[in-house]
């Protein structure tokens, strides 16, 4: 009788074993071992013993141990099974991005792998299983469609295999793909809302504000704003699932017309854009000219005022004869001139909405100085210990420098509170002195003595 | 009444120097711009310089610039030309005189004058 | 600088006479102008400044018209006393440029 042992082997892939081969009869005409595997017979004492290594087994094998005795001839087979972990696990591509709502079929492929009995195939979210199914066919294959919800964002899925030899008395072998991160992502239908001036004057800076409600995830949102081949640099401000992108654009003269505005929002695979069209247009203030701006009185002065060709102006509220971009008045200045404005407006249709500009130059008027009755008088009479006040106001542009002496030596103090003595009395030479030359007053004071019943 | 009085003139060598006093009296002295004017033997009166009330600004002649220095001590009530590098073409009465009134930001006509003092440069 | 010029440098004329002394500055000085009188071996003397007003203590004979660049001196009735030199002045800046004289004598 012919036995084997172990008569039942797992080993893994490439690994070696040891076989004895038996014979229960003392003196056998013939023991060994019939197999395609590399094998090499340990040297033992006895006759019905053989040990032979067996190595580089890479299939399962039933490697088959023989005797001839006198009895007769018999066989005893041993059944090697290998074991090992697949050459490839891997999820089928996906683009990262996927929007909500959409079914998305995860697909593993799974290359090699043995005993198959013993392999299974696990779909995984996270560590949550999806799927598990035993290996089947080469490459097995499981799939499995999972609906996108918002909540996946960021979810990493992944397909594991299970070698399960356990049962075998050996280990749980574990290969798992490399993850597959889903990036979950809404646009909405609407395109963004732009909101920017729909004329925009050259070498001036214009605000541009481009915004969008009912995104996920928002920050992962793109904006990109342009005006016509300018690209803008926004700041972007990002609440729950809205964004607003605020952006600064200066034109030049060279802008000048229509020109396109785009605002596209770009998420995942997906772009929503706005399109509106921004006229650019020169609108210099228009030019208030004074043949001085300032003069003496007496001067004969012009007023002129000149706009944009196609502007119509207004000067002092007065429009132009005719209509247009040119105005002018004729005045002689007079000291009521002295800081008179005037102002011209002038109006520009861009694109239908009226642009206004305005310029403004005030005229001065040098007069003076003045010294009058009114303001300086002549002659004040003050009891003597009252307290008064000595007043004299000159006028003039500029204003002029006052002063009062008497005898060349003592000042009047004016506009000061004195009390009336008898050194004030006397004729004061009052002075008015300004860049338009000088005036001069004599102003007496008489100071009343207490009478002594 | 205001009085100027003047004192320091004399007979000087061309390129030597010479310092020209000038008192005040019965007027408050430090309220007034101070000037010097000259007047050569058989000409007109030339001004030459001027002081501001407090002595922080002071304005000068072509003719002398460079060469005459005005200055003041209010606290001794006297006006002074330093004359230095002097030419016979300085020969003059020299003459102080008073801003009629203490403006502010000018000068004005002179309503007191000293009574002169002589200059020769002679070698 | 701004120039000064008298014209005429010297004049005769008979007591009693009216006279006038003409003074022009070469930019416009508005009435920063003044007269002085000067008697031989002594100061000069304030007559006139901002080119009308008298001096206190100066006869009213003595009157200044004038304003921007052309003024005058009149001696409206010329005494004896009033032999003299006359000098105006420009005094709104410096220098504080004088004429060059006018000397008046009598008849």
């Known amino acids: 009788q012919t036995s084997v042992s172990p008569s039942k082997v797992i080993l893994p892939r490439g690994g070696s074993v040891l076989v004895t081969c038996s014979t229960s009869c003392d003196q056998p005409k013939l023991l060994g071992i019939e197999t395609p595997l590399p094998k090499k017979e340990l040297l033992l004492p006895g006759n019905n013993r053989k040990v032979y290594e067996l190595s580089n087994v890479q299939e399962d094998s039933q490697p088959m141990c023989y005797s001839n005795c006198p009895d007769g001839q018999s066989t005893a087979k041993t059944f090697l099974t290998v074991y090992w972990t697949p050459e490839r696990v891997e999820l089928a591509p996906l683009p990262s991005w996927q929007p909500v709502g959409k079914n998305l079929t995860l697909r593993c492929q799974v290359e090699g792998g043995a005993p198959r009995a013993n392999l299974t195939v696990v779909l995984l979210r996270g560590e949550k299983e999806l799927k598990r199914e035993p290996a089947v066919g080469e490459p097995a294959e499981v799939t499995t469609t999972v609906l996108v919800r918002r909540d996946h964002h960021g979810a990493n899925f992944s397909c594991r295999t299970e070698l399960d030899l356990r049962p075998q008395g050996l280990e749980l072998f574990e290969n798992t793909s490399a993850p597959y991160q889903l990036q979950t992502f809404v646009l909405p239908a609407t395109p963004p809302q732009l909101v920017s001036p729909r004329v925009l004057e050259v070498d001036t800076q214009g605000t541009v504000v481009c915004s969008l409600d009912g995104l996920f995830p928002v920050s992962e949102a793109q904006v990109h704003l342009a005006l016509g081949d300018q690209r803008l640099n926004p700041t972007v401000t990002y609440g729950n699932d809205s964004f607003s992108a605020k952006a600064s654009v200066s034109v030049t003269a060279e802008d000048e017309g229509t020109q396109r505005l785009t605002c596209a929002v770009i998420l995942g695979n997906q772009s929503q854009e706005t399109l509106q069209t921004v006229t650019i247009y020169s609108f210099p203030a228009p030019n208030v000219i004074l043949t001085k701006p300032e003069v003496s009185e007496g001067t004969e002065v012009t007023v002129k005022c000149e706009a944009h060709p196609r502007a119509k102006v207004t000067l002092n509220g007065v429009p132009a004869q005719p209509l247009g971009p040119r105005a002018q008045l004729l005045l002689k200045a007079t000291p009521e001139d002295n800081g008179r404005s005037f102002s011209c407006s002038a109006t520009l249709e861009v694109a239908g909405q009226l642009i206004h500009k305005n310029q403004t130059r005030e005229l001065r008027v040098l007069y003076g100085p003045r010294l009058d009755e009114r303001d300086c008088p002549g002659n004040w009479t003050w009891p003597e210990n009252s307290q008064q006040t000595p007043m004299c106001q000159a006028w003039g542009n500029p204003l002029p420098e006052l002063k009062c002496l008497k005898d060349g030596t003592f000042p009047l103090p004016i506009g000061e509170s004195v009390t009336v003595t008898r050194d004030l009395e006397g004729t004061y030479l009052c002075r008015a002195r300004s860049t338009q030359g000088e005036v001069t007053r004599k102003v007496t004071v008489n100071v009343l003595s207490p009478r002594y019943e | 009444q205001m009085q100027l009085v003047q004192s320091g003139g004399g007979v000087v060598q061309p390129g030597r120097s010479l310092r020209l006093s000038c008192a005040a009296s019965?007027?408050?002295?430090?309220?007034?711009?101070m000037h010097w004017v000259r007047q050569a033997p058989g000409k007109g009166l030339e001004w030459v310089a001027v002081?501001?009330?407090?002595?922080?600004?002071?304005y000068y002649a072509d003719s002398v610039k460079g060469r005459f220095t005005i200055s003041r001590d209010n606290s001794k009530n006297t006006l002074y030309l330093q004359m230095n590098s002097l030419r016979a073409e300085d020969t003059a009465v020299y003459y102080c005189?008073?801003?009629?009134?203490?403006?502010?930001?000018?000068?004005?006509?002179?309503?007191?004058w000293g009574q002169g003092t002589m200059v020769t440069v002679s070698s | 600088d701004i120039v000064m010029t008298q014209s005429p440098s010297s004049l005769s004329a008979s007591v009693g006479d009216s006279v006038t002394i003409t003074c022009r500055a070469s930019?416009?000085?508005?009435?920063?102008l003044a007269w002085y009188q000067q008697k031989p071996g002594k100061a000069p003397k304030l007559l006139i400044f901002?080119?009308?007003t008298l001096q206190s203590g100066v006869p009213s004979r003595f009157s200044g018209s004038g304003s921007g660049t052309d003024f005058a001196l009149t001696i409206s009735s010329l005494q004896p006393e009033d032999v003299a030199s006359y000098y105006c002045?420009?005094?709104?800046?410096?220098?504080?440029?004088f004429g060059p004289g006018t000397q008046v004598d009598i008849k």
């Open positions: 005189a008073k801003d009629f009134y203490n403006w502010n930001d000018w000068h004005d006509a002179f309503d007191i």
């Open positions: 019965g007027l408050t002295f430090s309220s007034y711009g």
């Open positions: 002081i501001s009330y407090d002595g922080s600004n002071k």
């Open positions: 930019q416009d000085i508005s009435n920063y």
């Open positions: 901002a080119a009308s």
């Open positions: 002045q420009k005094y709104n800046h410096v220098p504080q440029t």
